[in-house]
Interface confidence: medium
């Protein structure tokens, strides 16, 4: 039975040209995390594998950095980065947990700075 829950940063915003940390946290389970996939819509951004470490998709290598932890840092943000991001936790024996984050990249300097994991 899947008992775990994923906490995410929820809806966050950041300024164009800036950076943001996408963070998920799996709790309430003793399942072993074997791999975390980060996706934007259905496009794979990065993977953190327990055995093999980090892999960043070639098309995002210049703008995506691994970490902190199992999180993902997006850099040089553009308005096109606005949208849904998913953290997909592969665990054993529970199965797969998915968390959702919505990022809005703003043109102006009115981005909310309240998000816990946002980089100033």
């Amino acid at each position: 039975m899947m008992t775990g829950t994923i906490e995410t940063t929820g809806n966050i915003s950041a300024e164009k040209g800036g950076s943001i940390i996408l963070q998920c946290h799996l709790s309430s389970t003793t399942a072993q995390v074997t791999q975390v996939n980060w996706e934007q819509q259905d496009q794979l951004l990065a993977i953190c594998n327990a055995d093999l470490g980090w892999h960043i998709s070639p098309s995002f290598k210049d703008r995506v950095a691994p970490g902190p932890g199992l999180g993902l840092t997006l850099q040089s943000l553009t308005v096109n980065d606005t949208g849904e991001y998913f953290c997909i936790y592969h665990t054993y024996p529970d199965g797969t947990y998915t968390g959702r984050i919505f990022l809005e990249v703003l043109e102006s300097s009115v981005a909310e700075h309240g998000a816990r994991f946002q980089i100033p």
Partner: antibody
Framework: QVPLVESGGGLVRPGGSLRLSCAAS????????MSWIRQAPGKGLEWVSY????????YSADSVKGRFTVSRDNAKSSLLLHMNSLRAEDTAIYYC??????????????WGQGTLVTVSS | DIQMTQSPSSLSASVGDRVTITCRAS??????LTWYQQKPGKAPKLLIY???SLQSGVPSRFSGSGSGTDFTLTISSLQPEDFATYYC?????????FGQGTKLEIK
């Protein structure tokens, strides 16, 4: 050259044991997750077990949990399946298969030719 | 566990036909869907991964589409060597699960 070759299948009585081997060649074995997948005669495919590249993480289907153990020897590029307390319903062709690679977990690009396990009295 | 259901279970078609096989997942698997081809007495062969990516060496007449719970495999113009059994498999979560197969036969 076939990159995966299974061996060790045969006829065994119910309750008996068997050890299947899969010899890998032509790729860096230690970089890949590996699986055992079986197919009963005339039936579909059933995933059996899975092992991470280092061998530190092992997964098993509920139908074989506690009876089958998967292991690997990266120095010898070999995958093993120890099968205990065999039942008639374990009769199948057993394939070893390679995970496609980083980011494509649970998707299998290389398969062996299979080895037949028959459990019968 | 995630259940995979294929339809039809068997299909008769002629060389040159366009054929579509469908696969439905019991829950959202995003794009984590794989298609295999199996010929009698042979091991399965990977055709399509992540729903629409063509495996290297697979002819371009094979294509895959879909996301979420509904997926399709299309063969644009059947060739004699395409008559085989086709399986879908969800690669989203352990335990991996396969569809029951679709046997493609010559009409």
């Amino acid at each position: 050259q076939v990159p995966l070759v299974e061996s060790g299948g045969g006829l065994v009585r119910p309750g008996g044991s068997l050890r299947l081997s899969c010899a890998a060649s032509g790729f860096t074995f230690s970089d890949y997750y590996m699986s055992w997948i079986r197919q009963a005669p005339g039936k579909g495919l059933e995933w059996v077990s899975y092992i991470s590249s280092s061998g530190s993480t092992v997964y098993s289907a509920d139908s074989v949990k506690g009876r089958f153990t998967v292991s690997r020897d990266n120095a010898k590029s070999s995958l093993l399946l120890h099968m205990n307390s065999l039942r008639a319903e374990d009769t199948a062709i057993y394939y070893c298969a390679r995970d496609r690679g980083f980011g494509e977990s649970y998707c299998f690009d290389y398969w062996g030719q299979g080895t037949l396990v028959t459990v019968s009295s | 566990d995630i259940q995979m259901t294929q339809s039809p279970s068997s299909l008769s078609a002629s060389v040159g036909d366009r054929v579509t096989i469908t696969c439905r997942a019991s829950q959202n698997i995003r794009s984590y869907l794989t298609w295999y081809q199996q010929k009698p007495g042979k091991a399965p062969k990977l055709l399509i991964y992540t729903a629409s990516s063509l495996q290297s060496g697979v002819p371009s007449r094979f294509s895959g589409s879909g996301s979420g719970t509904d997926f399709t495999l299309t063969i644009s113009s059947l060739q004699p060597e395409d008559f085989a059994t086709y399986y879908c498999q969800q690669s989203y979560s352990i335990p991996c699960s396969f569809g029951q197969g679709t046997k493609l036969e010559i009409k």
